[in-house]
C-alpha cells in the first residue's frame, strides 16, 4: 500500500511568500511624487514580484518628537487621504496583495517611542489597531521595539487585539538587535509574532558562519514560524557586497519562514551608488530618469526597466525565486535539514512528504569550490539522491533542467544552486 499522505499544516497568507516593505513612499515613487494614489499605480509591479504582502509606511501624522501632534488615526495629508488609503486597500485586495500598516509612532523623531510617555503612546497604538483593523488592513508593523519599555507585554496586548479581530491578521515587530537571547525573549511571550531583526546582518563572511546562525536560530525557535531578513528596515546592500546579493536572495526565499524584503532589494538598489541619497531610503530606480541629480550616474542595468528586460538580472532571479517559493509545497512548509558540504559552503534540503524536494547549495567564498555533500548528516527521511536536476543558479548560463551528479558538484565563486529531485519511497 502507498504510504499515507502527511497532513498539511494550517497555512496563513504570510506563510505563502514574501513581504515587501515600502517605508518611504516618496523615495519609492520618486519624481517628487510619493502618495497613496501613486502607490496604487505600482501594485501591478508588486504583483509581478509575486509578493504576498506590502508593509507600508508609517504614513500617519507625526510632528517630530511631539506626542500631542502625533495622530495614528490620521494619514499625513502629504501622503493622501483616508479615501486614497481605502482605494489602495481595495485595489491591493483585488490583486491578492495584503496591506500591513507600520504604526511606529515617532517615525520622524529621535526616539521612535517617545521614551518619556510610553503609556500615552501605548494607548494611542491600541486605539489605532482597532481603528485600522476596522478599516480593513491585514496587519501591523512596529519597529525599534528595543526602545519600547516593557515591549514584551505591550506586544502581547497588541497581538491579542490583532488576533482577536481575526486569526488572519498579522503583527510584525522590528528590532535592531542581533542578539539571539534578546530576540528569543521577545518571541517567548508572543506566539504568533513575526519578528524582523539584524540577526543575520553579520552573516556575510562565510558559509559556515551563516549555517551556524541559521541552524542556531531554527533550533532555538523550535517549530514556530520565522521571518528572514537582514534588518528591520534597511536594504540588503547596506550589509552585503553586490556579489552576495543573489546568494542571499536564494537563501532568504528557501529558508523555512517568511522572507521580508525592502523596496529595491529586488534590483540591488544601493544608496552608496547614488550620491546625496539617504542610506535608509534612497530613491527607487524605475528607469534611468529616476535619479536626475547626476547625469549618467544611473545605467539601465541598475533600474527596474533595464532589469525587467534582462533574464539574467537580479530582478529576474527575484521573480523566479518568489514564484517557486509560493507554489512548491517543500518550500512553502517543508522540513529543513542543513548538512556539511565543505568549507565556505552552506547547504540544506527542504522536503515535504512525497512532494518534490529541493537542495540548496551556497558558496559564500570568492573561489570556486567542489561541494563535498555529506549525506551522512541527514536523517533517512531526507536522504540525498545520486543526481538532482538544476532548477536555477544565481549565476547565468548553467543549463537549467539538466541532471547533475551531486558527487561532482562544483560552484563558482559566490554561486548558489537550487536543485530539485523527486521523492523516493
Amino acid at each position: 500500500r502507498a504510504p499515507r499522505c502527511r497532513e498539511l499544516p494550517a497555512q496563513k497568507w504570510w506563510h505563502t511568500g514574501a513581504l515587501y516593505r515600502i517605508g518611504d513612499l516618496q523615495a519609492f515613487q520618486g519624481h517628487g511624487a510619493g502618495n497613496l494614489a501613486g502607490l496604487k499605480g505600482r501594485l501591478d509591479y508588486l504583483s509581478s514580484l509575486k509578493v504576498k504582502g506590502l508593509v507600508l509606511g508609517p504614513i500617519h501624522k507625526n510632528q517630530k518628537d511631539d506626542v500631542a501632534q502625533t495622530d495614528l488615526l490620521q494619514i499625513d495629508p502629504n501622503f493622501g487621504s483616508k479615501e486614497d488609503f481605502d482605494s489602495l486597500l481595495q485595489s491591493a485586495k483585488k490583486k491578492s496583495i495584503r496591506v500591513i500598516l507600520d504604526l511606529t509612532p515617532n517615525y520622524r523623531g529621535e526616539n521612535s517611542w517617545f521614551s518619556t510617555q510610553v503609556d500615552t503612546v501605548a494607548t494611542k497604538v491600541k486605539d489605532a489597531l482597532e481603528f485600522w483593523l476596522q478599516a480593513g488592513v491585514d496587519g501591523f508593523q512596529v519597529r525599534d521595539i528595543e526602545n519600547l519599555k516593557d515591549a514584551s507585554s505591550f506586544l502581547a496586548e497588541w497581538q491579542n487585539i490583532t488576533k482577536g479581530f481575526s486569526e488572519d491578521r498579522l503583527l510584525i515587530a522590528g528590532t535592531n538587535s542581533s542578539d539571539l537571547q534578546q530576540i528569543l525573549s521577545l518571541l517567548e511571550s508572543n506566539k504568533d509574532l513575526l519578528l524582523t531583526s539584524s540577526y543575520l546582518s553579520d552573516s556575510g563572511s562565510t558559509g559556515e558562519h551563516t549555517k551556524s546562525l541559521v541552524t542556531q536560530y531554527l533550533n532555538a525557535t523550535g517549530n514556530r514560524w520565522c521571518s528572514w531578513s537582514l534588518s528591520q528596515a534597511r536594504l540588503l546592500t547596506s550589509f552585503l557586497p553586490a556579489q552576495l546579493l543573489r546568494l542571499y536572495q536564494l537563501m532568504l526565499f528557501t529558508l523555512p519562514g517568511t522572507p521580508v524584503f525592502s523596496y529595491g532589494d529586488e534590483i540591488g538598489l544601493d544608496a552608496a551608488a547614488l550620491p546625496g541619497q539617504p542610506m535608509e531610503a534612497p530613491v527607487m530606480l524605475w528607469d534611468e530618469s529616476s535619479f536626475p541629480d547626476i547625469p549618467g550616474a544611473v545605467s539601465a542595468n541598475m533600474t527596474v526597466k533595464g532589469q525587467s528586460e534582462d533574464p539574467g538580472s537580479l530582478l529576474s532571479l527575484f521573480r523566479r525565486l518568489s514564484d517557486q517559493r509560493s507554489k512548491e509545497r517543500s518550500l512553502l512548509h517543508g522540513d529543513f535539514h542543513a548538512f556539511s558540504a565543505g568549507p565556505g559552503l552552506f547547504s540544506y534540503i527542504r522536503h515535504w512528504d512525497q512532494n518534490e524536494r529541493f537542495l540548496v547549495v551556497l558558496n559564500f567564498g570568492d573561489v570556486g569550490l567542489s561541494a563535498g555533500l555529506q549525506a551522512s548528516d541527514l536523517p533517512a527521511s531526507a536522504s540525498l539522491p545520486a543526481k538532482a536536476d538544476l532548477l536555477l543558479s544565481t549565476q547565468p548560463g548553467r543549463e537549467e533542467g539538466s541532471p547533475l551528479e551531486l558527487e561532482r558538484l562544483k560552484l563558482e565563486p559566490h554561486e548558489g544552486l537550487l536543485l530539485r529531485f523527486p521523492y523516493a519511497a
Epitope: 543558479s393 548560463g397 533542467g401 563558482e412
Partner: antibody, heavy 124, light 113 residues
Framework: QVQLQQSGPELVRPGVSVKISCKSS????????VHWVRQSRAMSLEWIGI????????DYNQQFKGKATMTVDKSSSTVYMELARLTSEDSAIYFC?????????????????WGQGTSVTVSS | DIVMTQSPSSLAISVGQKVTMSCKSS????????????LAWYQQKPGQSPKLLLY???TRESGVPDRFIGSGSGTDFTLIISSVQAEDLADYFC?????????FGGGTKLEIK
C-alpha cells in the same frame, strides 16, 4: 560514439497531433538532458524546451507551452515530443540535441550533439 | 527573451579569403563573476543538422579547425574564418547560452564564389 537518432518525416493534416522520437546511444543516457529545437524558414532556430532524462522534469520555452509535450522512456533511452493542434506554421524540421559543454560540474546551453532532424509538414 | 541579430544575412567569398560575420545580442552576455561571455557559434551545411563550432565566445569544440576564430564581449560578437575553404559553405548561427530560453540569431549564409 554518441548518436541521437530521430524518427522519420511526417506529413499531417491541420488540427491533428504528431509524436516524434529521439533515441540516444553511445553515452550514459541519464547523465545528460535532451533539448528540442525547431528550424523553420520563417523563424530560424527556436529552442522548444529541455527534458531531464534522469527525473522526467521538463522546462518549456513559454512560446511552446500547450503546443509541445515531452516525455522520456529510460528503458529504451528515448525521448519523445508530441506536437498538438498542428497548423501550417508548425511545418518545420524538429531537432533533438544534447547539451554537453561541461563547466563547473554543470552543462551549458551549447549543444554538442544533434539528431538528424525530423521534418514535419502540415498540409490539407 | 534575449534577441540575437546576425549580419550580413548572406555573403559570397572566394576560397582563401578571410570572412567576418557579426552577431549582436539585446543584452550583455558577460558573466562578470567569471568574465566569460556566453555565446556559441554553429555551422549548418545544406541538408545537415547544426554543428557546434565555438562556445564561451572563443572556445573551440574539439575537431574544429583553428581557422575559425571567435571574439567579442558584452553584446557584440564576431566569427572570423581566417582562410575560407570550399567545405565551409554553410549557414552560420550564433546562440546565447547565457539565460533561459537560449536564443539563436537568424543566420549568415556563406556562399563560395
Amino acid at each position: 560514439q554518441v548518436q541521437l537518432q530521430q524518427s522519420g518525416p511526417e506529413l499531417v493534416r491541420p488540427g491533428v497531433s504528431v509524436k516524434i522520437s529521439c533515441k540516444s546511444s553511445g553515452y550514459a543516457f541519464t547523465d545528460y538532458a535532451v533539448h528540442w529545437v525547431r528550424q523553420s524558414r520563417a523563424m530560424s532556430l527556436e529552442w522548444i524546451g529541455i527534458i531531464s532524462t534522469y527525473s522526467g522534469n521538463i522546462d518549456y520555452n513559454q512560446q511552446f507551452k500547450g503546443k509541445a509535450t515531452m516525455t522520456v522512456d529510460k528503458s529504451s533511452s528515448t525521448v519523445y515530443m508530441e506536437l498538438a493542434r498542428l497548423t501550417s506554421e508548425d511545418s518545420a524540421i524538429y531537432f533533438c540535441a544534447r547539451g554537453g559543454r561541461h563547466y563547473y560540474g554543470s552543462y551549458y546551453y551549447a549543444f554538442d550533439y544533434w539528431g538528424q532532424g525530423t521534418s514535419v509538414t502540415v498540409s490539407s | 527573451d534575449i534577441v540575437m541579430t546576425q549580419s550580413p544575412s548572406s555573403l559570397a567569398i572566394s576560397v582563401g579569403q578571410k570572412v567576418t560575420m557579426s552577431c549582436k545580442s539585446s543584452q550583455s552576455l558577460l558573466n562578470r563573476n567569471n568574465q566569460k561571455n556566453y555565446l556559441a557559434w554553429y555551422q549548418q551545411k545544406p541538408g545537415q543538422s547544426p554543428k557546434l563550432l565555438l562556445y564561451f565566445t572563443s572556445t573551440r569544440e574539439s575537431g574544429v579547425p583553428d581557422r575559425f576564430i571567435g571574439s567579442g564581449s558584452g553584446t557584440d560578437f564576431t566569427l572570423i574564418i581566417s582562410s575560407v575553404q570550399a567545405e565551409d559553405l554553410a549557414d552560420y548561427f550564433c546562440q546565447q547560452h547565457y539565460s533561459t530560453p537560449p536564443t539563436f540569431g537568424g543566420g549568415t549564409k556563406l556562399e563560395i564564389k
